[in-house]
């Protein structure tokens, strides 16, 4: 997912609804005007705000990268939700890109978890049941399996 950016405030177009701030804040889906006296609606599909705020601009909507699918579009109150395509996943420690899931487990291990958009396949040792550390095995060690079916 591209890093969340912020859209500069633009002059209110005629279709942008205005209301007054409440306790100095504007509701989700709005930002405060440059003089602090009005709430201006975010532009659907372009920017958004999720909380009560006194931001002078709305947050720019995320665009899903290639290799991602759009689960839900950006609205004035919620950012776009992107997900890795089938067969790829996004790790917590490297959220900026989708990585290919491994096709199988190393020799002596069995698959106990499938590839999901947020996790690689999970392998455990046949005997001990302990999880594999996650490094990709050498090709000759790999026991292949099609996604969703356990390794033999």
């Amino acid at each position: 997912i591209t890093q969340q950016d912020l859209a500069p405030q633009q002059r209110a177009a005629p279709q942008q609804k205005r209301s007054s701030p409440s306790e100095g804040l504007c509701p989700p889906g709005h930002h405060i005007s440059e003089d602090g006296r009005d709430c201006i609606s975010c532009k659907y599909g372009q920017d958004y705000s999720t909380h009560w705020n006194d931001l002078l601009f709305c947050l720019r909507c995320t665009r899903c990268d290639s290799g991602e699918v759009e689960l839900s579009p950006c609205t004035t109150t919620r950012n776009t939700v992107c997900q890795c395509e089938e067969g790829t996943f996004r790790e917590e420690d490297s959220p900026e890109m989708c990585r290919k899931c491994r096709t199988g487990c190393p020799r002596g291990m069995v698959k106990v978890g499938d590839c999901t958009p947020w996790s690689d396949i999970e392998c455990v040792h046949k005997e001990s049941g302990t999880k594999h550390s996650g490094e990709v095995p050498a090709v000759e060690e790999t026991v292949t399996s099609s996604p969703g079916t356990p390794a033999s």
Partner: antibody, heavy 117, light 110 residues
Framework: EVQLVETGGGLIQPGGSLRLSCAAS????????MIWVRQAPGKGLEYIGF???????YYADSAKGRFTISRDNSKNTLYLQMNSLRAEDTAVYYC???????????WGRGTLVTVSS | DIQMTQSPSSLSASVGDRVTITCRAS??????LSWYQQKPGKAPKRLIY???TLASGVPSRFSGSGSGTDFTLTISSLQPEDAATYYC????????????FGGGTKVEIK
Amino acid sequence: EVQLVETGGGLIQPGGSLRLSCAASGFTVSRYAMIWVRQAPGKGLEYIGFITSDGSTYYADSAKGRFTISRDNSKNTLYLQMNSLRAEDTAVYYCARYTYSDGTDLWGRGTLVTVSS
Amino acid sequence: DIQMTQSPSSLSASVGDRVTITCRASQSISTYLSWYQQKPGKAPKRLIYKASTLASGVPSRFSGSGSGTDFTLTISSLQPEDAATYYCQPNSGIATYGAAFGGGTKVEIK
């Protein structure tokens, strides 16, 4: 002339309370957001909190619970009530007019608060 | 909260030199940043707002630029009266994120 004048500073013992005043002239405080900023000796500017034109108040984490911002529209004056004062609260306290996109466009000259036994 | 990181913390330059001070925000603030000048024993004075708009009465040798997270204050030809400390401050989301000033840059004349 458009100006802000802070008063109420002085020497106060630790644990004591003090109320600073900021008298505005040339404009109406209730039509603007107003902020308080302080500066410890030899240090940088520290934001304390602000009051919006509708009277809502917001504070920096360091000021929550001990400091209270208010205003008296009839006197065109802003206040900063400071309780449970500590030595580290020793600073020059400034009030200023905050204009959202245009920043803090008008500052008072400041009042010195010294917390010491 | 938004954190503002200013650099350098101090500098020494000669009259006529071009001086550049930078300010980085911990998250994007579009162009909603102000710069202030403070001389010893005096209150701060606004120099620039909306990143690049010169405040009334400020000499044209001062200029500001930047957007998003990275901003610059430039003094095109340093004058003796420019010896002061300079601060940046975000102006969007003061209630939402606070309004922490940058740590300041002290400019001295060689």
